[in-house]
Interface confidence: low
């Protein structure tokens, strides 16, 4: 459509729009008190309310306070985001006996398996330890990190929690951030596998591993305990969590007992070169520069790939798909990715500032 590349004078006389030279087109001007959900809003619903810090925009478009995890038996599972509350869960060594919206009203210590019983399923933040009778001939010691048995009493005392560094938390699901409410609800039902081992991990004989007994007295939790700022990788090694100390990075998820800290580019920047659990190179956003061209494609799955324009062509931030159709996807490897999903007449405004995660997806965080 030739009309799809308006010149600067296209917007003149229309006070509800302004011309953005960076993207070379007319953009909708968000009314006072509303903030754009994307670089160049296209319609009124690309604007949204901005909530105060520690508040999120609920499904009725109300700013609602995020729950707090300040109780000492709770840890933050997912942070307060622009469209979802903070989620708290019981800290390691405890499980939730009375649930509450986005949190837990009562946490209890995991039970310890009595004499003659071993751990069938270790306790989690949601469930107590499940015990089963020990097989004949099995020593009453810890046979493996998963199978512990206490040699003492026949009752089930409350377990002592495994000591946990204040720097760690028991994050068992990826934070649900950005996207639409429906996508968020779907994502919140998904749990993630532990992060892949880092290539810069320490071997378990290094000081990353605390010299605690494999099965602390009175505990039904047999996992290793790593030093602060280390996590237990899939191979059972204590591995250093990545650091977000670079100026252009912020922490996305904390260093947890079984997963690395993850870093993302700070608000106003986007990841140009990704790295395991972090970003190797952040560049300023917006990114429609003279040497890049946007290729519209399957916005939902592959997002928008920015790549060098073909030789001899004039760079253009917004090529129109020929015949109204998006071209086939190109490999997004080390490309700049901007998620365009949440912009179709959506009743899900997003808050400024726009942080962009290490996957390149906008993380629109009010928390």
């Amino acid at each position: 459509f030739p009309q799809d590349r308006p010149f600067e004078d296209t917007c003149h006389g229309n006070p509800s729009h302004y011309y953005d030279k960076a993207v070379r087109r007319c953009c909708y001007r968000c009314p006072m008190g509303l903030f754009p959900t994307q670089q160049c809003p296209q319609r009124p619903t690309d604007c949204r309310k901005q909530c105060e810090p520690d508040y999120y925009l609920d499904e009725a478009d109300r700013c609602t306070a995020c729950v707090t995890c300040s109780r000492d038996d709770l840890v933050e599972k997912t942070p307060c985001a622009w469209n979802s509350s903070r989620v708290c869960e019981c800290r390691p060594g405890m499980f939730c006996s009375t649930s509450a919206v986005n949190s837990c009203a009562r946490c209890f210590f995991h039970s310890v398996c009595p004499a003659g019983m071993i751990v069938k399923f270790p306790g989690t933040a949601q469930k107590n330890t499940v015990c089963e009778p020990a097989s004949p001939g099995v020593s009453p010691a810890c046979a493996s990190p998963e199978n512990c048995k206490e040699p003492s009493s026949g009752t089930i005392p409350q377990a002592k929690p495994t000591p946990v560094s204040p720097a760690t938390s028991s994050a068992s699901t990826m934070p649900v951030r950005g996207g639409t409410r429906l996508a968020q609800e779907a994502a919140s039902k998904l749990t993630r596998a532990p992060d892949s081992p880092s290539s810069v991990g320490r071997p378990s004989s290094d000081p990353g591993l605390s010299p605690t007994q494999p099965c602390p007295e009175g505990s039904g939790d047999c996992r290793k305990q790593c030093e602060p700022d280390y996590y237990l990788d899939e191979a059972g090694r204590c591995t250093a969590c990545v650091s977000c100390s670079r100026d252009d990075l912020v922490e996305k998820t904390p260093c947890a007992w079984n997963s690395s800290r993850t870093c993302e580019c700070r608000p106003g920047m986007i990841c140009a070169t990704s790295a395991t659990n972090s970003c190797a190179r952040c560049v300023p956003y917006p990114i429609c520069a003279a040497e890049t061209v946007t290729k519209p494609q399957d916005m939902a799955e592959k997002d928008t790939t920015f790549e060098a324009p073909p030789l001899g062509t004039q760079p253009d931030c917004n090529p129109t798909p020929e015949n109204g159709e998006a071209p086939a996807s190109t490999s997004p490897t080390q490309s700049l990715l901007v998620d365009s999903q949440a912009s179709k007449t959506l009743p899900i405004p997003t808050s400024a500032p726009v942080a962009l995660s290490s996957t390149g997806k906008p993380v629109l965080d009010a928390g």
Epitope: D4, R43, P44, T294, A326
Partner: antibody, heavy 124, light 107 residues
């Protein structure tokens, strides 16, 4: 040739269910928002539901919310509308339509491709 | 919800006449308005998108204008094949809504 073909319509009793399908061909299905629009006999057009590229976002008219579910299978280039708790007022020709909306590309609006429609009759 | 009010509901004009249909939105929708033509027993066809842009392959006698809440659709010279019902549709917010339609007949 860009084409949408609806199927699955028919006669159903009040309270019953139907599943409509819309087979897309001739374009990159996963790159487009898709919609269902209906038209009761002798009446105007009524938007029913929409779904985003990946299916991550869905939208419904108040009249069908909680009863109808829109979904898509991009691997099969097919759009669906699961209709439960059908009422007499749901009787209509149901059209699937392609929405060429693409964010960051101005003036890409409008249902530019429509199917031929499938008739759903809810009657006892 | 955004209500779309179309007028007139029907009109009769002679071949060659200039025909004008108006559409009013209950709130500001900027220029997010489309116009469709529907012939009996057929699916609707997009004619005008984003208030004033002519869809590819649509004759230039069809045009659209307007912004905010008031929009106009014009057939500059009515032809026999233009007998149909015309609908406006707002694309500014969900639920998307259509006008009630204008039936155009030849005198």
């Amino acid at each position: 040739e860009v084409q949408l073909v609806e199927s699955g319509g028919g006669l159903v009793q009040p309270g019953g269910s139907l599943r409509l399908s819309c087979a897309a061909s001739g374009f990159t299905f996963s790159s487009y928002y898709m919609h269902w629009v209906r038209q009761a006999p002798g009446k105007g057009l009524e938007w029913v539901s929409a779904i985003s590229w990946s299916g991550g976002s869905t939208y419904y008219a108040d009249s069908v919310k909680g009863r109808f579910t829109i979904s898509r299978d991009n691997s099969k280039n097919t759009l669906y509308l699961q209709m439960n708790s059908l009422r007499a007022e749901d009787t209509a020709v149901y059209y699937c339509a392609r929405d060429r909306f693409m964010p960051f590309i101005p003036n890409t609006l409008g249902f530019d491709v429509w199917g031929q429609g499938t008739l759903v009759t809810v009657s006892s | 919800d955004i209500q779309m009010t179309q007028s007139p509901s029907s009109l009769s004009a002679s071949v060659g006449d200039r025909v004008t249909i108006t559409c009013q939105a209950s709130q500001d929708i900027s220029n997010y308005l489309n116009w469709y033509q529907q012939k009996p027993g057929k699916a609707p066809k997009l004619l005008i998108y984003v208030a004033s842009n002519l869809e590819t392959g649509v004759p230039s006698r069809f045009s659209g204008s307007g912004s905010g809440t008031d929009f106009t659709f014009t057939i500059s010279s009515l032809q026999p094949e233009d007998i149909a019902t015309y609908y406006c549709q707002q694309d500014a917010d969900v639920p998307l809504t259509f006008g009630q339609g204008t039936k155009v007949e030849i005198k």
